[in-house]
């Protein structure tokens, strides 16, 4: 979109489930009528229009000019449509990955789930909710990032080597918090600052590793909007 015209942004991790929230304010008198509610989710991809599924033509409508800053916009398409009787239609390649929670729908939650989210899912989403006597909408932009943990130096380590683990997610803003942990038999054990563990933002410095440090290390990045991502790395220290 042109600067100054932006919809709320939802971040998701490539390969992980993503929730596209839609819980519009519904007047109390309409809550009992939610079983008859219909919802249509539309997707306008960020780039490169997805191939049309045979037998599922893209939705009718105008094909308007894009803002001057863009090239031609990829054509929008219906991801999923749920009619008043719960009848569903949508785009075939997506359908196994796309879900609406039926119980949620009856509570007024029309969120779309992508299980898992893929890079091609990025773009603008619009949900149109049809109730008995009113229509409501939700709009958001889905951005997808890749999570990774790197070790420097990479590969297997020897006892008393040093290593720096760097936890990252491809998102422009910095995480609000970073938590490190180790996966042990009894679950996650937090990693705290100590002579053996030096924490600095998204880095963990181990000045002298031992075979005891072998195994899975993890971090959780939490962002200001509440989005969080958990990343694991398997450290190998040779005796």
């Amino acid at each position: 979109l042109q600067p100054g015209a932006e919809v709320p942004v939802v971040w998701a991790q490539e390969g992980a489930p993503a929730q596209l929230p839609c819980s519009p304010t519904i007047p109390l008198q309409d809550l009992s009528l939610l079983r008859r509610a219909g919802v249509t989710w539309q997707h306008q991809p960020d780039s490169g229009p997805p191939a049309a599924a045979p037998g599922h033509p893209l939705a009718p409508g105008p094909h308007p000019a894009a803002p001057s800053s863009w090239g031609p916009r990829p054509r929008r398409y219906t991801v999923l449509s749920v009619g008043p009787g719960g009848l569903r239609s949508g785009r075939l390649p997506l359908q196994p990955r796309v879900q609406l929670d039926e119980r949620g729908r009856q509570r007024g939650d029309f969120s779309l789930w992508l299980r898992p989210a893929r890079r091609a899912d990025a773009g603008e989403y619009r949900a149109a909710v049809h109730l008995r006597d009113r229509a409501l909408s939700c709009r958001l932009r889905l951005r997808l990032g890749q999570a990774s943990m790197t070790a420097s130096p990479p590969g297997s380590l020897r006892a008393s080597d040093w290593v720096i683990l760097n936890c990252s997610f491809s998102r422009p803003d910095r995480p609000a918090s970073v938590h490190w942990f180790r996966n042990r038999g009894q679950g996650r054990v937090p990693v705290r600052e100590s002579p053996h563990h030096h924490l600095a933002e998204s880095f963990l410095f181990l000045p002298q590793v031992s075979p005891m440090d072998s195994g899975p290390w993890g971090c959780i990045l939490t962002y200001r909007d509440g989005f969080n991502v958990s990343i694991m790395y398997n450290l190998t220290v040779l005796g």
């Epitope: 015209a5 409508g61 619009r126 049809h130 909408s137």
Partner: antibody, heavy 120, light 107 residues
Framework: QVQLVESGGGLVKPGGSLRLSCAAS????????MSWIRQAPGKGLEWVAY????????YYADTVKGRFTISRDDAKNSLYLQMNSLRAEDTAMYYC?????????????WGQGALVTVSS | DIQMTQSPSSVSASVGDRVTITCKAS??????VAWYQQKPGKAPKLLIY???YRYTGVPSRFSGSGSGTDFTLTISSLQPEDFATYYC?????????FGQGTKLEIK
């Protein structure tokens, strides 16, 4: 080309009835939601009624609810507005409009309008 | 219902001028705002939808911006055919509502 042509406007007494028709051409009428929008003389635009492409959902402005009925006949490529119990404040130019998408409620094609005058 | 308040109600300008019309929604409508142009005795015409997308065939001098509750229609260099009344409309939720209109007159 894409066209909407209204008919059925005229002068009617308060309490009377009138039926507006809208003939659509140049596009696949059955694939589009449709709406009626009105404009009182010298005033702004007011949305009146809406029907989805499949006719599953119909909505009305509070000012006309219970008095006006929107309907469509996809076989005839036609939209209708049945107006009962007309009041002086219903006097307006009534526009038949195409809704861009069932799920994107702006109006991309407009007819030339049908004038409805309610007066004794 | 969502109220749409346009300002100014009228504006005088000359050919070549840059003109800005604003529209304020009574609640958040994300980017669900359209702009229409209406000339006397004619039906309105769609110019902009979803706050910033120009409709097919609309000249590039027309642009829209905004999100949330504040929206703007800008005409970068007025042409003689641009003197008309402009309306904003929220297309977020029913009932779909319009601003009261801004009349653009020749100075």
């Amino acid at each position: 080309q894409v066209q909407l042509v209204e008919s059925g406007g005229g002068l009617v007494k308060p309490g009377g009835s009138l039926r507006l028709s809208c003939a659509a051409s140049g596009f696949t009428f059955s694939s589009y939601a449709m709406s009626w929008i009105r404009q009182a003389p010298g005033k702004g635009l007011e949305w009146v009624a809406y029907v989805t492409s499949g006719g599953d959902y119909i909505y009305y402005a509070d000012t006309v609810k219970g008095r006006f009925t929107i309907s469509r006949d996809d076989a005839k490529n036609s939209l209708y507005l049945q107006m009962n119990s007309l009041r002086a404040e219903d006097t307006a130019m009534y526009y038949c409009t195409r809704v861009a998408y069932d799920y994107e409620w702006y109006f991309d094609v407009w007819g030339q309008g049908a004038l409805v005058t309610v007066s004794s | 219902d969502i109220q749409m308040t346009q300002s100014p109600s009228s504006v005088s300008a000359s050919v070549g001028d840059r003109v800005t019309i604003t529209c304020k929604a009574s609640q958040d409508v994300t980017t669900a705002v359209a702009w229409y142009q209406q000339k006397p005795g004619k039906a309105p015409k769609l110019l902009i939808y979803s706050a910033s997308y120009r409709y097919t065939g609309v000249p590039s001098r027309f642009s829209g911006s905004g999100s949330g509750t504040d929206f703007t229609l800008t005409i970068s260099s007025l042409q003689p055919e641009d003197f008309a009344t402009y309306y904003c409309q929220q297309h977020d939720s029913s009932p779909w509502t319009f601003g009261q209109g801004t009349k653009l007159e020749i100075k």
